[in-house]
């Protein structure tokens, strides 16, 4: 293959791969017809002048995961056909000016996961055809004005995982073609008004895991094409009334892990395409009427791990397409019987880890498609007669860790649980808390003949019984409903992220695992 170095493998498709710790310099001679060269996991520490001079047909060059700390300015001379250059995962602290001169065809430049301390306008001034620039995972503390002014064709810019404390409002002004801008995991405390005004084609903006406290009211007003906006894990305590007003294309918005105390009606919208709204881990204490009414296509609404103690009966108005509603780990004591009435397509509702003492008999009256209800770890002593009778698709019901009062009034619930076993997931069984003679016994195996007669007046209304289990053979014998939407927190889905940190999500959804970035 036109002379393949012994340390490398060369394929018929003009691909050369050189790997191994024994490599300390760019191997020679490289095949003159090589179109793709990968130098990975070696002990190369520097690139000298023109090591690739004789492979001018090269289109892709990956020099990754090495010990590379120094590059001579002319290292990439004669690579006029190069379209893809990756120097990711090395030990570069500085880039020589002019390093990328002559790379007129370069479209993708990956400099991520190095130790770069600064970039200058002169670094990229020759890269007029660049479409993708990856600078995440470095030590950049600021971006000078003009750094990207010549990159007018850039569509993807990743500055995540640096040490940026502020952004100049002019730094992105010439990037009219930019579609993806990632600034996650920096130290930004605020974003000046106008910073994103020139980004009229922006589709994704990742600002999560910074220290942003305030959002300027018009910060996103020029970003009409924005589809994904990640604002999670910041210090945002309030949302200006008009901040999301000009985002008609938005389909993903994450606000979890902030300090939001309240949500005003109309704050979200109009966003006809928004499918998911993640608001867990905030300080929200109540939900007013019509707060989500502009989100007609919303399918996933996560409000868990807040301090919600009151939900207005019309809080969920307009959410006719909602499939998943997470309200777990809040401070709810009571729910209005009509609060879920508009959620005709709801499939999963999680209400665990609240202080619910009772549920209205009609709480699920219009939510006929419910498949999973999480009610564990509340203060429930009983449930109204017939509360689940019409839920023919229900196949997961969690009731454990409640102080069930096992007097004769518990029999309808006990019977329902027993007769509906084939439709319910195998889970921790509800246990009696009172009276004392049955405390600790499983609710479904208490001796009904010694169940204490009830002496209380029911606190909750019940509605007429309906057939609890239609006589059809179509119910499955075993069940395991898992809503993938609810099970996974939003992963900011970056193609250039190689590792995703997965955390045990029992506290976020109470079901399985999620990535909460």
């Amino acid at each position: 293959y036109h002379g393949c170095p012994s340390e490398c493998t060369c394929s018929r498709a003009s691909q050369v791969e050189c790997t191994g710790a024994r490599i300390v310099a760019v191997p020679t001679p490289l095949p003159w017809n090589a179109m793709s060269l990968q130098i990975l996991n070696t002990h190369i520490t520097e690139l000298n002048e023109s090591p690739f001079l004789n492979i001018s047909a090269l289109i892709a060059l990956r020099i990754e995961k090495n010990e590379l700390s120094r590059i001579t300015p002319g290292a990439f001379r004669n690579l006029g056909s190069l379209r893809y250059l990756s120097l990711a995962n090395n030990k570069l602290q500085v880039l020589p000016i002019g390093l990328f001169q002559g790379l007129d065809s370069l479209e993708s430049l990956l400099l991520s996961s190095n130790q770069l301390l600064q970039i200058q306008p002169a670094h990229f001034s020759q890269c007029s055809n660049l479409k993708e620039l990856q600078l995440h995972g470095n030590h950049l503390e600021y971006i000078p004005d003009g750094a990207f002014d010549h990159l007018v064709g850039l569509t993807k810019l990743n500055l995540g995982k640096n040490s940026l404390t502020h952004i100049s409002p002019r730094v992105f002004q010439h990037l009219g073609n930019l579609q993806v801008l990632r600034l996650y995991e920096n130290r930004l405390t605020d974003i000046p008004m106008g910073t994103f005004d020139g980004l009229v084609n922006l589709q994704e903006l990742a600002l999560q895991q910074n220290q942003i406290g305030l959002l300027s009211p018009g910060l996103f007003h020029n970003n009409h094409n924005l589809q994904r906006l990640y604002l999670s894990n910041n210090h945002i305590s309030q949302l200006p009334p008009s901040v999301f007003m000009q985002l008609p294309q938005l389909n993903r918005l994450t606000l979890f892990g902030n300090s939001l105390k309240e949500l005003s009606p109309g704050i979200f919208g109009p966003m006809p395409n928004l499918r998911e709204l993640w608001l867990y881990d905030n300080h929200i204490s109540s939900l007013p009427d019509n707060v989500f009414s502009n989100l007609r296509q919303l399918q996933v609404l996560i409000l868990s791990r807040n301090q919600i103690s009151f939900i207005s009966p019309g809080a969920f108005n307009g959410l006719t397409e909602l499939r998943e509603l997470s309200l777990h780990t809040n401070a709810l004591q009571d729910l209005d019987g009509n609060v879920f009435r508009m959620l005709a397509n709801l499939q999963n509702i999680s209400l665990q880890n609240n202080r619910l003492r009772q549920l209205p008999g009609n709480i699920f009256a219009n939510v006929n498609g419910l498949m999973a209800i999480q009610l564990q770890n509340n203060q429930l002593e009983n449930l109204p007669l017939g509360i689940f009778d019409h839920l023919g698709k229900l196949c997961e019901l969690r009731l454990y860790d409640n102080p069930w009062r096992c007097d004769s009034d518990i029999l309808p619930l006990r019977n329902w649980l027993l007769l509906n076993q084939p439709r319910l997931g195998t889970d921790t069984v509800p246990v009696c808390f009172s009276p004392a003679n049955v405390r600790g016994q499983s609710l479904i195996i208490i001796n009904v003949n010694v169940a204490v007669p009830s002496v209380h007046v029911p606190e909750v209304p019940s509605y007429p019984e309906t057939p609890w289990y239609p006589d059809t053979p179509s119910y499955p014998d075993t069940t395991s409903v898992s809503s993938t939407t609810e099970l996974t927190s939003p992963v900011e889905d970056y193609t250039d992220l190689t590792t995703i940190q997965v955390t045990d999500d029992r506290s976020v959804w109470g079901m399985t695992q999620a990535q909460s970035g």
């Epitope: 009778d389 004769s408 029999l411 309808p412 076993q421 069984v429 006589d471």
Partner: antibody, heavy 113, light 111 residues
Framework: QVQLVQSGAEVKKPGASVKVSCKAS????????IHWVRQAPGQGLEWISY??????KYNERFRGRVTMTRDTSTSTVYMELSSLRSEDTAVYYC????????WGQGTLVTVSS | DIVLTQSPDSLAVSLGERATINCRAS??????????MNWYQQKPGQPPKLLIY???NQGSGVPDRFSGSGSGTDFTLTISSLQAEDVAVYYC?????????FGGGTKVEIK
């Protein structure tokens, strides 16, 4: 005390129907399931169906031939079996609760031409 | 359907001795961590009587000499000290899923 009292013995011809009643007393009628089980002479027990809150569930072997109803005003449950055959000759029992904790005395249904 | 197989078909035990009846299910009858296996006693000319429910819980008024054990597919009814009035046919029954099914019965007699 809890009691389930069933109607008396029946003799039926093949193809006919029989309706057996089970009157409950001594407990809150609507709080418990009522099952029907039968036992052919010298044989074991076979579950037929149950009723609870007007919802019913049937053994597929009897589907289309058995109908369960109840009258809450008299605390009575009825089991009607149609298209009788000789192999339906058995003692028919009603039993209370999911765990069959109380049983009626049984009703002998004889199917013979 | 879940098939229950009882063994032995019949059992002769001396008064005061232990009697053990086994019941094997064709699939697990466990749910919620509870085994939905029940045991009934039937004397000639009488309806069955609930002895044990949910594998190990005694029915009302059932003498302490009757006990149940097991989980999953294998279950046992034990009469610790057989009395004359215990002569009967004993049935196991699963109530995990419809159709609820009974074992074929075990006849217990005095040796």
């Amino acid at each position: 005390q809890v009691q389930l009292v069933q109607s008396g013995a029946e003799v039926k011809k093949p193809g006919a129907s029989v309706k057996v009643s089970c009157k409950a007393s001594g407990y809150t009628f609507t709080s418990f399931v009522i099952h029907w089980v039968r036992q052919a002479p010298g044989q074991g027990l076979e579950w037929i169906s149950y009723i609870y809150n007007d919802g019913t569930k049937y053994n597929e072997r009897f589907r289309g031939r058995v109908t369960m109803t109840r009258d809450t005003s008299t605390s009575t449950v009825y089991m009607e079996l149609s298209s009788l055959r000789s192999e339906d000759t058995a003692v028919y029992y009603c039993a209370r609760d999911y765990y069959f904790d109380y049983w009626g005395q049984g009703t002998l249904v004889t199917v013979s031409s | 359907d879940i098939v229950l197989t009882q063994s032995p078909d019949s059992l002769a035990v001396s008064l005061g001795e232990r009697a053990t009846i086994n019941c094997r299910a064709s699939e697990s009858v466990d749910y919620y961590g509870i085994s939905f296996m029940n045991w009934y006693q039937q004397k000639p000319g009488q309806p069955p009587k609930l002895l044990i429910y949910a594998a190990s819980n005694q029915g009302s008024g059932v003498p302490d000499r009757f006990s149940g054990s097991g989980s999953g597919t294998d279950f046992t009814l034990t009469i610790s000290s057989l009395q004359a009035e215990d002569v009967a046919v004993y049935y196991c029954q699963q109530s995990k899923e419809v159709p609820y099914t009974f074992g074929g019965g075990t006849k217990v007699e005095i040796k």
